[in-house]
């Protein structure tokens, strides 16, 4: 069975084709080759002789037991080599010779018992080494690591490392890899020698499900003393063994580390006193809790010095009391409990993401809700009922506002966005908004992107609601049940580049409303009920138009619409997916491609 | 279409068939077997995925006695610092995991419950596997 040509001459997918040898009928120009799940078993010298351009090679689960000297020799362009799931028994010293550009080596689940005799010391370009899910017992980083000066990611998770000694990291003292991210999760650790990490700098350290008791966790974290780490991730996994007990003593040792960003990811334990628990983390710049249960929500009003707080997929009794002077970014998403938003006091806040919480807002939105006048980004998407009772007083700095898939109330009672003259992006898609007030978008003089799909309009008519949006470049009016539009609806939108009118109920097409859209490049009228043109004589669309989508409409391929059908043929160079433009009537022409019709007035005679 | 039996409990019988062409082997054990009136137990899965499990989610299509419920999307792996350790599993890596579950106080009427589980993962998104579970429910007391 032949390989699948994904990108001609470049990418070939040969997965699970029962190949016992490397295929010899692929072009020399092949750059990406997936040979996974083939019983190759043995890689001899110059196995990839015929693939001089190869950049990505996937050999996952190829039953490879032996890799000879020079197996990859001549693959000087190879950047990624994947060996996952091969039961390697014999790895020659020169197995990886010739890989002068290799950046990513994945040797997950390959029976690797030690880094010491893993022959990769010459791979100077290596950025990522993944040796997770192996049999490695010692964390001693061999001397050859001093050659791997570009290494950024080292994944040793799911190995057998129990202890870390001072001598294990000696090589890092000789050549501090300032950018190294190290994952040691799922190693059964019970001892870290104090001083082992002294004066070591890491970009990221991940330790999840490493400790089988609170005491072990405590002493191991104390053993990290002296470490300087940009981002520290601690926690557990839901499907692995979890700690019986967890209290404030667990994290006391963190006071002896220098940490920029901290994240606790999943803990099968109720956090009650977070002030004491995170006592050593009051001055990290970014603090993050993922998938934890928090009992006392008042604790977030303590004087933490965080600039970014992230609470994701957590459980709360009620919406937390947030009073944090220095906080600039708050991400509070996909959380449970506390369904009603309550005011927060965050005077420095610039970025606020409250999406996907099922929250309801009794009144939105003004400075008093968030306790800040600095807000630039606000995401309230995928929530419950949001009642618009104020037009963003004190929030004039906003540039990005997202309400999609929340239920907006009182949107057509006043000019909700009047004060948002700096707003660039607005998404009110699928918000149950019924536009019944022409001043709905007044004030949005800087707006560039407006998404309002899935809403509705009074009498299914689009009025002149965009008159102030002179900078608009993108407008989505799809799925709005529209049947008609004002001839001057778009007259002020001279910068508009993309207009989506798809999935509405238009029965005819008219070019007149678009005459002022001098920058329009994309117009999507797919999934309407267009049968014909509104007027006999259709003008041209703006000369800037490059893509016109009229697919999945109800074209009437009859003689009376001959001029419209001819006009469509004349627009052929603009039309996309023409094969999906089919006649709906008459019944004998149903399903015929509109552009293949021979339009003569013999049509129905 | 070959049917794979999972287990029997006092009020349910569970089996599944593949609903995709690939039919890559997957081993599923439930211990103790699910009782629909109340259940607590361990789900054990052994599987070698044909793509990375990063950003794994399930599309669930549930049918209760021929009545179709709306499609439900269950995100399992968000893509970074996920709840489950198997979210970091790579294509070709053995996934051998045990997940605890519990539910109580749900009253199910007698009949045939079907659940099509479409597993989607990776970037670009592609189907990982598709299984159709059939649960025959014989409540002792309804």
């Amino acid at each position: 069975e032949p390989c699948v040509e994904v990108v001609p001459n470049i990418t070939y997918q040969c997965m699970e084709l029962n190949f016992y040898k490397i295929p010899d009928n692929l072009p020399f120009s092949t750059k990406n080759l997936d040979l996974s799940f083939n019983p190759l078993r043995h890689l001899g010298s110059y196995s990839f002789f015929s693939f001089p351009e190869l950049q990505v090679l996937d050999l996952s689960r190829c039953e490879i037991q032996t890799i000879e000297d020079g197996a990859y020799q001549s693959l000087s362009h190879l950047s990624t080599l994947i060996l996952t799931g091969n039961p390697i028994q014999s790895l020659a010293l020169g197995a990886f010779s010739g890989l002068s550009s290799l950046q990513k080596l994945v040797a997950v689940e390959t029976n690797l018992a030690s880094l010491e005799n893993f022959p990769i010391g010459h791979l100077k370009t290596l950025k990522e080494l993944n040796v997770a899910h192996n049999l490695i017992q010692s964390f001693k980083l061999p001397e050859y690591f001093s050659n791997l000066t570009n290494l950024e990611h080292l994944d040793l998770s799911s190995n057998k490392i129990q202890s870390i000694y001072c001598t294990d990291l000696r090589v890092l003292h000789q050549m501090p890899l300032l950018n190294l991210s190290l994952d040691l999760s799922l190693n059964p650790m019970n001892f870290i020698q104090p001083g082992a990490f002294k004066e070591i700098r890491l970009h990221k350290l991940t330790l999840r499900n490493n400790f089988d008791s609170l005491n072990v966790m405590k002493t191991c974290i104390q053993g990290l003393a002296g470490l300087e780490v940009h981002r520290l991730v601690l926690g557990e996994f839901r499907n692995e063994g979890n700690l019986e007990k967890f209290d404030k003593s667990a994290l006391e040792g963190l006071c002896n580390l220098t940490i920029e960003e901290f994240r606790l990811a999943y803990l099968d334990y109720y956090l009650d006193d977070i002030i004491d628990l995170f006592n050593c983390l009051t001055n990290v710049s970014s603090f993050s809790l993922v998938s934890v249960t928090i009992e006392r929500v008042k604790d977030f009003s303590y004087n933490f010095g965080w600039q970014h707080l992230e609470l994701v997929n957590c459980k709360f009794g009620q919406f937390p009391t947030l009073k944090l002077k220095s906080l600039k970014r708050l991400t509070f998403t996909s959380n449970k409990g506390g369904n009603a938003f309550s005011e927060v006091d965050l005077p420095s806040l610039e970025f606020l993401d409250l999406s996907r919480n099922g929250l309801s807002f009794k009144g939105c939105c003004s400075q008093s809700d968030f306790g800040t006048t600095s807000l630039k980004y606000l995401d309230l998407s995928f929530n419950g009922v949001i009642t618009m009772s104020s037009n963003f007083l004190g929030l004039e700095q906003l540039e990005h506002l997202d309400f999609q898939h929340s239920n907006l109330k009182q949107m057509s009672e006043f000019s909700v966005f009047l004060s948002l003259r700096n707003l660039i992006y607005l998404d009110i898609s699928h918000t149950h908004t019924r536009v019944a007030f022409n001043g709905i978008f007044n004030g949005l003089s800087s707006l560039e992107v407006l998404k309002m799909a899935g809403n509705s309009f009074q009498e299914n008519f689009l009025p002149d609601i965009f008159t102030e949006l002179r900078n608009l470049t993108f407008l989505d009016l799809s799925q709005c049940q529209l049947e008609q539009l004002s001839p001057t609806a778009f007259n002020s939108l001279s910068s508009l580049q993309v207009l989506n009118m798809s999935h509405n109920n238009f029965f005819s097409l008219d070019t007149f409303p678009y005459k002022c859209l001098n920058s329009l490049q994309v117009l999507d009228y797919s999934l309407n009920h267009i049968m014909t043109s509104k007027k006999q004589e259709l003008q041209h669309f703006p000369s800037s138009l490059a893509f016109l989508n009229l697919t999945q409409n109800d074209f009437a391929c009859t003689c009376e619409h001959q001029s419209f059908l001819q006009w469509i043929k004349d627009q052929r160079q603009l039309l996309v997916e023409v094969e999906r433009m089919e006649c709906a009537t008459p019944s004998d022409k149903q399903g015929m491609p509109v552009l293949s019709l021979n339009i003569t007035c013999q049509m129905n005679k | 279409q070959k049917q794979y039996w999972v287990c029997n409990s006092s009020d349910a019988s569970i089996s599944y068939t593949y609903c995709d062409k690939m039919q890559y082997p997957i081993s599923i054990n439930v211990n103790p077997c699910i009782e629909l009136k109340r259940s607590k137990g361990l789900l054990h899965i052994f599987y070698i995925p044909r793509r990375d499990l990063k950003q794994l989610y399930f599309n669930l299509y549930i049918t209760v006695n021929t009545m179709n419920l709306p499609k439900r999307k269950e995100v399992i792996c968000r893509g970074s610092d996920d709840d489950y350790s198997f979210c970091r599993a790579l294509k070709g890596e053995t996934v051998n995991t045990t997940i605890s579950f519990s539910f109580k106080g749900i009253k199910f009427s007698k009949g045939k419950y079907k659940c099509v589980v479409e597993a989607i993962s990776g970037s670009p998104e592609e189907m990982l596997f598709c299984l159709e579970f059939v649960i025959l429910h014989q409540p002792n007391s309804n």
């Epitope: 040898k21 010899d24 072009p27 020399f28 001899g44 110059y46 002789f49 | -």
Partner: nanobody, 117 residues
Framework: EVQLVESGGGLVQPGGSLRLSCAAS????????MGWFRQAPGKEREHVAL????????YYADSVKGRFTISRDNAKNTVYLQMNSLKPEDTAVYYC??????????WGQGTQVTVSS
């Protein structure tokens, strides 16, 4: 078994030309691809040019594109490498290689090419 014998190497001035030949004998029916590699002192062996016996498709390394030409004479079981506009950095031992259907690679003994004024 496949035997490969190279010839045509030598000393040439920058800008000059040489033509290398590689004669194959033995189980030549099993050969899929043939090619030229080179190895300069202290460097890894690298591809120069490849040719597919079945359909004549060709590959050149970027460093030799437009200057070198690989060709084959099936009747003589010989592959050639015409090298024009030679540069000092082309100095190396040039090896002929043949890959069989079983993925085994056979090598010639090599021929020295020196480009120097």
């Amino acid at each position: 078994e496949v035997q490969l014998v190279e010839s045509g190497g030598g000393l040439v001035q920058p800008g000059g030309s040489l033509r290398l030949s590689c004669a194959a004998s033995g189980s030549i029916f099993s050969i899929n691809d043939m090619g030229w590699f080179r190895q300069a002192p202290g460097k890894e062996r690298e591809h120069v040019a490849l040719i597919r016996i079945k359909d004549g498709s060709i590959y050149y390394a970027d460093s030799v594109k437009g200057r070198f030409t690989i060709s084959r004479d099936n009747a003589k079981n010989t592959v050639y490498l015409q090298m024009n506009s030679l540069k000092p950095e082309d100095t190396a031992v040039y090896y002929c290689a043949a890959k069989t259907g079983t993925s085994f690679v056979y090598w010639g003994q090599g021929t020295q090419v020196t480009v120097s004024s």
